[in-house]
Interface confidence: medium
């Protein structure tokens, strides 16, 4: 299906979750003019880029822990 | 094949207004962003305008913003900039990108993929 | 607005040489950084996409790397087809910006 990219989001679908040992990184954009949605975009430890749903639960907890492994480095 | 080709730089003296055309084939132009990059004599790259696929959201450079207008018609596969009070410093080359780059199902990036051959607009009494 | 300041301005290399360039935005982009080739008198072309993926047929001896705000541009064994202007540009936000450009020139 053909998607139109409206203002400039990085995040066309989210995934619900993703386990946590596949990702390396968490980056999480704020809304801006650019996008008027929050969006989280993890890369993965293969390299690819997946855009998660930062309204899901799961996905809550990964960036806490992500952002908690972060911070005690 | 992807082509991109601008017409109607020109020469116009200052507070005057030009028209740029940028006619894309070979793609799905609806799908995509594009944007207008300029180039002065001599200079680096300055980028001007983008605008979403369906046209519903633009952005513009502070440079330019109030006197410029990017918009689109997807029935006809064309991008356009309308520049209005134009000033000496408005000099240069003026090329259209397709903002290209899908990456996975669920990311998405922005890179001007695919560019015109450029159309000079040179602005001067 | 992101500033993305490029150095070197320009460098002087020979034909088989290993070269680098680096961009640094004024705040963090993640990887948000393409890296784009300009011949005189020709439009840009697209080398490197989300700062180290590489554009479909563009040669193995580029590559990118850096996240961040820290970001580089390798050349390894220079071609004669490779002295051209290479410049960086940032799409984390609007306004887009890009470097001021490194001119690569033959010794």
């Known amino acids: 299906a053909s998607v139109v990219t409206e203002l400039r989001c990085q995040c066309l679908q989210t995934l619900q979750g993703i386990h946590l040992k596949n990702i390396q990184s968490v980056n999480v954009r704020s809304p801006g003019p650019h996008c008027a949605q929050t969006e989280v975009i993890a890369t993965l430890k293969n390299g690819k880029k997946a855009c998660l749903n930062p309204a899901s639960p799961m996905v809550q907890k990964i960036i806490e822990k992500i952002l908690n492994k972060g911070s005690t480095n | 094949e992807v082509q991109l080709l601008e017409s109607g730089g020109g020469l116009v003296q200052p507070g005057g207004s030009l028209r740029l055309s940028c006619a894309a084939s070979?793609?799905?132009?609806?799908?995509?962003?594009m944007s207008w990059v300029r180039q002065a004599p001599g200079k680096g790259l300055e980028w001007v305008s983008a605008i979403s696929g369906s046209g519903g959201s633009t952005y513009y450079a502070d440079s330019v913003k109030g006197r410029f207008t990017i918009s689109r018609d997807n029935s006809k596969n064309t991008l356009y900039l309308q520049m209005n009070s134009l000033r000496a410093e408005d000099t240069a080359v003026y090329y259209c990108?397709?903002?290209?780059?899908?990456?996975?199902?669920?990311?998405?990036?922005?890179?001007?993929?695919?560019w015109g051959q450029g159309t000079p607009v040179t602005v001067s009494s | 607005d992101i500033q993305m300041t490029q150095s070197p301005s320009s460098l002087s290399a020979s034909v088989g040489d290993r070269v680098t360039i680096t961009c640094r935005a004024s705040q963090s982009i993640s990887d948000n950084l393409h890296w784009y080739q300009q011949k005189p008198g020709k439009a840009p072309k697209l080398l490197i996409y989300d700062a180290s993926n590489l554009e479909s047929g563009v040669p193995s001896r580029f590559s990118g790397s850096g996240s961040g705000t820290d970001f580089t541009l390798t050349i390894n064994s220079l071609q004669p087809e490779d002295f051209a202007t290479y410049y960086c540009?940032?799409?984390?936000?609007?306004?887009?910006?890009f470097g001021q450009g490194t001119k690569l020139e033959i010794k």
């Open positions: 540009q940032q799409y984390y936000s609007t306004p887009l910006t």
């Open positions: 990108a397709r903002e290209g780059g899908r990456l996975e199902p669920y990311y998405y990036y922005y890179a001007m993929d695919v």
């Open positions: 070979g793609f799905t132009f609806s799908e995509l962003s």
